[in-house]
Interface confidence: medium
């Protein structure tokens, strides 16, 4: 039975040209994590495999950095990076757990003045 749960950073926003860390955390299971895939729509961004180590897909290697931990850092963000990102945890013996993150990349001025992060 799959008892684990994936906690993610949820819906996040970041400035165009900036960077963002995508993080997922698998909890409530003793299953062994054998591989984590990071995917965006139909494209594989990166793999972190227990045996293979990190592998960044060629089309993203200039803008994607592994870590921290099993997370992924996206750099030099563009508006086209807006969308859904998935962390896919392959585990043994449980199977596959998936977390979803929605990233919105905003023009600098919008991000600076976004109500979501304003401090009174």
């Amino acid at each position: 039975m799959m008892t684990g749960t994936i906690e993610t950073t949820g819906n996040i926003s970041a400035e165009k040209g900036g960077s963002i860390i995508l993080q997922c955390h698998l909890s409530s299971t003793t299953a062994q994590v054998t591989q984590v895939n990071w995917e965006q729509q139909d494209q594989l961004l990166a793999i972190c495999n227990a045996d293979l180590g990190w592998h960044i897909s060629p089309s993203f290697k200039d803008r994607v950095a592994p870590g921290p931990g099993l997370g992924l850092t996206l750099q030099s963000l563009t508006v086209n990076d807006t969308g859904e990102y998935f962390c896919i945890y392959h585990t043994y013996p449980d199977g596959t757990y998936t977390g979803r993150i929605f990233l919105e990349v905003l023009e600098s001025s919008v991000a600076e003045h976004g109500a979501r992060f304003q401090i009174p």
Partner: antibody, heavy 120, light 113 residues
Framework: QVQLVQSGAEVKKPGASVKVSCKAS????????IEWVRQAPGQGLEWIGV????????NYNEKFKGRATITADKSTSTAYMELSSLRSEDTAVYFC?????????????WGQGTTVTVSS | DIVMTQSPDSLAVSLGERATINCKSS????????????LAWYQQKPGQPPKLLIY???TRESGVPDRFSGSGSGTDFTLTISSLQAEDVAVYYC?????????FGGGTKLEIK
């Protein structure tokens, strides 16, 4: 263009080892995982294992663990698959393949295949 | 390991007719989180390596004619050739790329009737 050129046919005696090479060209060798797949005469396809040429990390089909060793030489852009303790049922065509960015198990680029015959 | 079972083992179809090949996996290849099926179809002609036709159960690889289509989800998948051409004579394989070890079906040999 992308090319994977494999070494020539081999005839081996039972108990011996064979080392098949796969020389890559037309792309950055460390950017893509290299997989090995075999096909016995008149049979289907069997996945042997994978290497990340960037890190040297490997992952094997449990069936081949301890008998197959996959390595990569970055200086010559060549991947190798060595199979030891050969038996007659290892007679097969051995293929190397390169995945593409839609997923870590899809192989649009293949070597031409290397025929390994195990016979006393 | 995920076991992939193809049917039929062989199939004879007239030129211009529809050919249908089925593939069943022992575990679901659907990732419910992103709604993607991790299933691919390959075509192999004698003396050649396999050629990727379809991935994600239904997405054609670039350059593959649109008479080839894939469908299905979870554990049941189908490859359809809408109008068989002489050059389609080959063995067709389905493949799990959901989890290691990647496993292939036993193959379906397609011939002209």
């Amino acid at each position: 263009q992308v090319q994977l050129v494999q070494s020539g046919a081999e005839v081996k005696k039972p108990g011996a080892s064979v080392k098949v090479s796969c020389k890559a060209s037309g792309y950055a060798f460390t950017d893509y995982l290299i997989e090995w797949v075999r096909q016995a005469p008149g049979q289907g396809l069997e996945w042997i294992g994978v290497i990340n040429p960037g890190s040297g990390g490997t992952n094997y089909n449990e069936k081949f663990k301890g008998r197959a060793t996959i390595t990569a030489d970055k200086s010559t852009s060549t991947a190798y698959m060595e199979l030891s303790s050969l038996r007659s049922e290892d007679t097969a065509v051995y293929f190397c393949a390169r995945y593409h960015y839609y997923g870590s198990g899809l192989f649009p680029y293949w070597g031409q295949g290397t025929t390994v015959t195990v016979s006393s | 390991d995920i076991v992939m079972t193809q049917s039929p083992d062989s199939l004879a179809v007239s030129l211009g007719e529809r050919a249908t090949i089925n593939c069943k996996s022992s575990q679901s290849l659907l990732n419910s989180g992103n709604q993607k099926n991790y299933l691919a179809w390959y075509q192999q002609k004698p003396g050649q390596p396999p050629k990727l036709l379809i991935y994600g159960a239904s997405t054609r690889e670039s350059g593959v004619p649109d008479r080839f289509s894939g469908s299905g989800s979870g554990t049941d998948f189908t490859l359809t050739i809408s109008s068989l051409q002489a050059e389609d004579v080959a063995v067709y394989y389905c493949q799990n790329y959901h989890s290691y070890p990647f496993t292939f079906g036993g193959g379906t040999k397609l011939e002209i009737k």
